[in-house]
Interface confidence: low
């Protein structure tokens, strides 16, 4: 279930599966929310640790019970992963924070007469992740009303300093607020060029597209289907970047599909998550249980409610069947996209929902004269 | 909304218009929305108006203006009033509205969370208020949301500033001493939230108030919290399961 | 004391023109629905217009509509009736009424004017 | 449009007398129904409003009772007061009237 408490004073000990640095336990927690494997995640506030190297620190963790044991730590804040969350899922994060400078690759520098000027152009900017405004009192004149256009390797921080006079935030991409607008065509037999930031294998070109979406540094994507003459590149996502934010060149190629990240579309963004069932399709992974169930659609269900679960494979094989039962592997990996992808089955595949924001799975920890 | 600011696209998703289609079309309140098929309101929004067709329900807009004939809106389904409440009164001032289609939920249309049943024990300090209603007392309806941070009052205080009116356990009030801002006509039955532990959570329906935004006048609100017994119950007893965000 | 005087009646020949008012006192007047209802002599009673508080919001009975407009100046605590195309079949005794509950809606009315007579005659 | 219709139109009754009047709608309209009294020249006045409930000032002898489409205005016992004419009025949807009941001396 949904889990949304937080825990003052207290810190998750062991688990940890990534770490980072943010500006709060809220952008911590969004953080663990949308990483495959992360259930629980503590934050470190700069008031609750001297060591320089870990203030702000944001530990990501998993645990194959779902808990961990929680140690005292003055000022920490631990607390649960959303998946499961429905409506409460979201990368959006629009809190500005002041009295700190969020640092990354600064890429591009302006006059801006706010803080929320510096916000909207790192939302209409397509590389922009994050950006450190210097108010109009910072102690250097020359830098005042500076805006710092960031990003970074993993689309948050590589360090965090409290600094007077400097406020700091995140795009607002995410909350389908960017002007930049997007590209919704997938391109057939087209193959993008430039940097690939990551690697996935995908049913689909559209789960690659979501996949690319969310991730932090992609902007566009090609995926290699099933029939792709080289057999260990099929079914592989390539997610990709570029300095321009533009592939700088494509090459006609039969089966292939490329196509964009959603992230800079204007009032609408996909859900973090792929409700499709791709029969006759068997997701590779590491095993995480086996239950009887009928048919598919439980199947799916049993792996949404299990929090760990990110993909499923439900076998309609004679020995796998028990009267109208029939077994359902439920599976995960490290990056939450299946480790192998294999066609001509019998059977069926798909991903857990836990991510999608529609659910009602959703719960909240939320005069005389009439108006 | 008194003294407040404008708002922007995503920032409160959960706001919803409340429109009425006679000869013209007409914002009369605001609302909550709290599930894919529910709003929360104030009751006396349908005040001699109960019936569903005139009604049309906006959500994920900001700016009035931007509505044409186009713009998609839901239809009700029910009105679900609260059983005790009274025309000639403000008490129970809480109504449920069922739409007829469910809605998908998107950064710009998805649910308030509500509080736990009872919730006294919380002290919240980052509370707004939204809608489009007046920016002055002989005001007009505003075209884009406007937002307001407004601090919650105890009951006491409140009670004091209105000795004609009984102000009970399940309103809730919000002001500023001096005054300055507040609710206003229009507003009524759009949310009162507040953050907590990062997450905002429906704590009063804007209700009524002495004038708007007058010194020692604050609004009255609602207490959303008194009332998630009735919101549960109804929304459950519909359909047989719970369509709205509840309590942990 | 909360009173409300209606003003304007008179005799006007058929398809002419005639504006009806209702001067409020005694109340916040900008916080009410007002509303206009008729009666010929006679006869019973008749809804004829309804405004909201703000004023945004008007309605009419089908009989008047297109015909007749209401509309506030709440800074004089005023209501207006403006009748256009008058026909024999307005003639009755125009009343201004309101709810005086201490919060606005569409209701009963427990607050009346005394009434102005508009006869429509050649 | 919802209808009003009141019946009966006339009634005699002495002083004293249990008197009731019924309203019926064409269409269900809750308990958003009012009555009124209304004397020669004189503007009406409210008795009863949403149905059942008394407006302020009126006497216990008047009570109203129905919801949906049947309603009812009882006066439990006739005063000289009393002799009027005798309106329902839905406020559901817009506003309409029944065409009156007019209560005489028998």
């Known amino acids: 279930g949904c889990l949304t408490q937080l825990y003052e004073n207290a810190f998750f000990r062991g688990g940890d599966v990534a770490s980072m640095y943010t500006p709060n336990a809220q952008y911590c927690q969004m953080r663990c929310t949308f990483h495959p494997r992360c259930l629980l995640f503590s934050f470190l506030p700069a008031s609750s640790i001297n060591d320089m190297e870990k203030r702000f620190g944001c530990f990501l963790k998993d645990s194959v019970t779902g808990t961990l044991p929680k140690v005292h730590r003055t000022g920490a804040v631990s607390g649960h992963s959303l998946k499961q969350c429905g409506h409460q899922i979201s990368a959006c994060h629009r809190d500005i924070y002041k009295g700190v400078d969020m640092r990354g690759v600064n890429f591009n520098v302006s006059k801006v007469s706010s803080v929320e000027e510096c916000q909207k152009r790192c939302t209409s900017n397509i590389r922009c992740q994050f950006f450190s405004y210097a108010t109009q009192t910072f102690h250097k004149a020359e830098y005042r009303n500076n805006c710092l256009l960031k990003y970074s390797p993993g689309g948050t921080p590589t360090a965090i300093k409290v600094l007077s006079n400097v406020e700091s935030g995140f795009s607002l991409k995410p909350c389908a607020l960017s002007e930049i607008g997007c590209h919704m065509n997938i391109f057939q037999h087209l193959a993008f060029s430039d940097v690939d930031v990551a690697r996935v294998l995908t049913p689909d070109a559209f789960v690659c597209r979501t996949i690319c979406t969310y991730h932090p540094n992609c902007l566009f994507f090609t995926f290699y289907t099933n029939v792709w003459k080289i057999e260990s590149q099929r079914n592989v996502c390539l997610l990709k970047t570029s300095e321009s934010g533009t592939p700088s060149s494509s090459t006609p190629q039969e089966n292939t599909i490329s196509g964009y990240s959603l992230l800079t579309c204007k009032r609408t963004l996909p859900e973090p998550c792929h409700s499709k069932i791709y029969p006759g399709v068997d997701f590779g992974g590491e095993e995480l249980n086996v239950t009887f169930v009928k048919g598919v659609n439980v199947c799916q269900e049993t792996c949404t409610k299990m929090i760990r679960c990110q993909f499923f494979t439900y076998s309609l094989l004679p020995e796998d069947c028990k009267e109208e039962k029939c077994k359902c592997f439920l599976r995960l990996s490290m990056d939450g996209s299946p480790t192998r992808i294999a066609y001509g089955t019998q059977g069926s595949s798909g991903y857990s929902l836990r991510l999608c924001n529609t659910g009602d799975n959703s719960v909240c920890t939320t005069k005389t004269s009439t108006r | 909304i008194v003294g407040g600011t404008n708002s922007s696209w995503g920032e409160w998703p959960w706001q919803v218009s409340l429109q009425v289609k006679l000869t013209a079309q007409r914002h009369l309140c605001g609302g909550s929305l709290i599930g894919h098929q529910w709003v929360l309101t104030a009751a006396h929004c349908f005040d001699g108006l109960p019936l569903q067709d005139v009604w049309r329900i906006y959500s994920g807009i900001l700016n009035l203006s931007d509505i044409t004939k186009d713009t998609p809106f839901s239809q009700i389904k029910e009105i679900i009033i609260h059983q005790n409440y009274k025309v000639s009164e403000g008490n129970h001032d809480i109504a449920l509205i069922k739409l007829q289609a469910p809605l998908n939920y998107t950064e710009f249309q998805k649910p308030i969370c509500l509080p736990s049943k009872g919730d006294t024990s919380t002290i919240y300090t980052n509370c707004w208020v939204t809608g489009w209603g007046f920016s002055k007392e002989k005001g007009e309806i505003q075209n884009i949301l406007q937002k307001v941070n407004i601090p919650l009052v105890t009951n006491e205080e409140c009670q004091k500033r209105y000795q004609d009116y009984k102000i009970t356990q399940r309103m809730v009030c919000a002001g500023y001493k001096e005054g300055g801002k507040d609710a206003c006509k229009g507003d009524s039955g759009g949310p009162l939230v507040c953050k907590h532990n990062g997450m905002w959570r429906l704590v009063g329906i804007t209700s009524w108030g002495e004038g708007c935004a007058r010194r020692e006048q604050p609004g009255v609100y609602t207490k959303v919290a008194e009332y998630m017994d009735w919101i549960l119950e109804k929304t459950q007893s519909s359909d047989g399961k719970a369509q709205m965000q509840s309590p942990a | 004391e909360v009173q409300l005087l209606e003003s304007g009646g008179g005799l006007v020949q058929p398809g002419g023109s005639l504006r009806l008012s209702c001067a409020a006192s005694?109340?916040?007047?900008?916080?009410?629905?007002m509303m206009w209802v008729r009666q010929a002599p006679g006869k019973g009673l008749e809804w004829v217009s309804g405004?909201?508080?703000?004023?945004?919001?008007?309605v009419y009975a089908d009989s008047v509509k297109g015909r007749f407009t209401i509309s506030r100046d709440n800074s004089k605590n005023t209501l207006y009736l403006q009748m256009n195309s008058l026909r024999a079949e307005d003639t009755a005794v125009y009343y201004c009424?309101?709810?005086?509950?201490?919060?606005?809606?569409?209701?009963?009315?427990?607050?009346w004017g005394q009434g102005t007579m508009v006869t429509v005659s050649s | 449009d919802i209808q009003m219709t009141q019946s009966p139109s006339t009634l005699s009754a002495s002083v004293g007398d249990r008197v009731t009047i019924t309203c019926r709608a064409s269409?269900?309209?809750?308990?958003?129904l009012a009555w009124y009294q209304q004397k020669p020249g004189k503007a009406p006045n409210l008795l009863i409003y949403k149905a059942s409930t008394l407006e302020s000032g009126v006497p216990s002898r008047f009570s109203g009772s129905g919801s949906g489409t049947e309603f009812t205005l009882t006066i439990s016992s006739l005063q000289p007061d009393d002799f009027a004419t005798y309106y329902c009025?839905?406020?559901?949807?817009?506003?309409?009237f029944g065409q009156g009941t007019k209560v005489e001396i028998k």
């Open positions: 269409q269900s309209i809750s308990s958003w």
């Open positions: 405004i909201y508080s703000s004023g945004g919001i008007t």
């Open positions: 009025q839905q406020y559901n949807t817009y506003w309409t």
């Open positions: 009424a309101y709810r005086r509950t201490g919060i606005p809606r569409w209701d009963a009315f427990d607050i």
């Open positions: 005694g109340f916040t007047f900008s916080h009410y629905i």
